[in-house]
């Protein structure tokens, strides 16, 4: 014998209290698949969470974070405070990156500058708290008689297309 609940579509629940009628989900609840015996409570985006997608009868709400915070975890299960570039978040708040480390994002940890000498290269541009060092050609490449290195193309100004 077919389960009468199997015909209940998403957005409804098979209501045993009411003779297994396929009852539409009550407010602030949803069922994303058919044949459900209950509707799930909608996620509420409160505090540092804000609503990215409203809950419907067939799908849960989706949250992201208010400005100054970013999502962590599956489905944005947590919001973590943003820091400035050149900082990392510690238990005591945002702290500047130590000398020799950098962070070019508003999240995550400070990472050590690249050690150019490990690749046999020299430092072309020094690192900062916000930027990694830029490694240049190896000293041997710059010795007299070595093939000339093509200089990098000049950076275009934003908004200008090549002629």
């Amino acid at each position: 014998l077919q389960d009468p609940c199997s015909n209940c579509p998403a957005g409804t629940f098979c209501d045993n209290n009411r003779n297994q009628i396929c009852s539409p989900c009550p407010p602030n609840s949803f069922s994303s698949a058919g044949g459900q015996r209950t509707c799930d409570i909608c996620r509420q985006c409160k505090g540092v969470f804000r609503t990215r997608k409203e809950c419907s009868s067939t799908s849960n709400a989706e949250c992201d974070c208010t400005p100054g915070f970013h999502c962590l975890g599956a489905g944005c299960s947590m919001c973590e405070q943003d820091c400035k570039q050149g900082q990392e978040l510690t238990k005591k708040g945002c702290k500047d990156c130590c000398f020799g480390t950098f962070n070019d994002q508003k999240r995550g940890i400070c990472r050590p500058w690249t050690n150019c000498s490990l690749d046999g290269k020299s430092v072309l541009v020094n690192g900062t708290k916000e930027r990694d060092v830029v490694c240049g050609p190896s000293p041997a490449d710059l010795s007299p008689g070595a093939s000339s290195v093509t200089p990098p193309a000049p950076a275009r100004e934003p908004g200008h297309s090549p002629q």
């Epitope: 009468p4 015909n7 209940c8 579509p9 957005g11 003779n19 297994q20 396929c22 539409p24 009550p26």
Partner: antibody, heavy 118, light 112 residues
């Protein structure tokens, strides 16, 4: 927009049957239960039964058990209510109503007047 | 069957004044999901009923906020904060928790 349009008025003799139709539009017909409610002159509203979403499973009020049949044609998005062995007390306006939110009839048909007269 | 009893049966109101209708059920209308399965409907003269309040206190889409529902268990109330001429008609409560679903006998609201 979401609406339910019912068939026209009927005049029937005692002992006969009447079949009222209710055509749904503007929504997915099989996603919502359809209920039937009647109102005799000067009386309160009286629930007759429902047809379940998708499956066509039905439940009837004991007061009409054996005399009422609720069916549906999903391809035509239409629900039907047939009442047999009509009596003068069955003279009423018959409404179809969608249960669009939990436990509530959010859309009603315009009603079908059924007169039972010899 | 669950018996629904409304009071008053007739309610003359001056426009702009508040109005209150009571509905009592012979059994508790609390569903296992925590909602009270009680609805309020208005049937205007010559029209089909229309949903006002569902699950005890949730206003239906498009219903003016002067209508509010409250109560739990067996005692429920529909309040109209300021009655308008268009509110005239018969108000019904209905329980959709247990078959057969049953309606109150209706409260006729009229303008003084």
């Amino acid at each position: 927009q979401v609406q339910l349009v019912q068939s026209g008025a009927e005049v029937k003799k005692p002992g006969a049957s009447v079949k009222v139709s209710c055509k749904a539009s503007g929504y997915t017909f099989t996603n919502y239960p359809m209920h039937w409610v009647r109102q005799a002159p000067g009386q309160r509203l009286e629930w007759m039964g429902w047809s379940n979403a998708g499956s066509g499973n039905t439940k009837y009020s004991q007061d009409f058990q054996g005399r009422v049949s609720i069916t549906r044609d999903t391809s035509a998005s239409t629900a039907y209510m047939e009442l047999s062995s009509l009596k003068s007390e069955d003279m009423a306006i018959y409404y179809c109503a969608r249960e669009g939110v939990a436990g509530a009839f959010d859309i009603w048909g315009q009603g079908t007047v059924v007169t039972v007269s010899s | 069957d669950i018996v629904m009893t409304q009071s008053p049966l007739s309610l003359p109101v001056t426009p702009g004044e508040p109005a209150s209708i009571s509905c009592r059920s012979s059994q508790r209308l609390l569903h296992s999901n925590g909602f009270n399965y009680l609805g309020w409907y208005l049937q205007k003269p010559g029209q089909s009923p229309q949903l006002l309040i569902y699950l005890g206190s949730h206003r239906a889409s498009g219903v003016p906020d002067r209508f509010s529902g409250s109560g739990s268990g067996t005692d429920f109330t529909l309040k109209i904060s300021r009655v308008e001429a268009e509110d005239v008609g018969v108000y019904y409560c209905m329980q959709p928790l247990q078959i057969p679903y049953t309606f109150g006998q209706g409260t006729k609201l009229e303008i003084k």
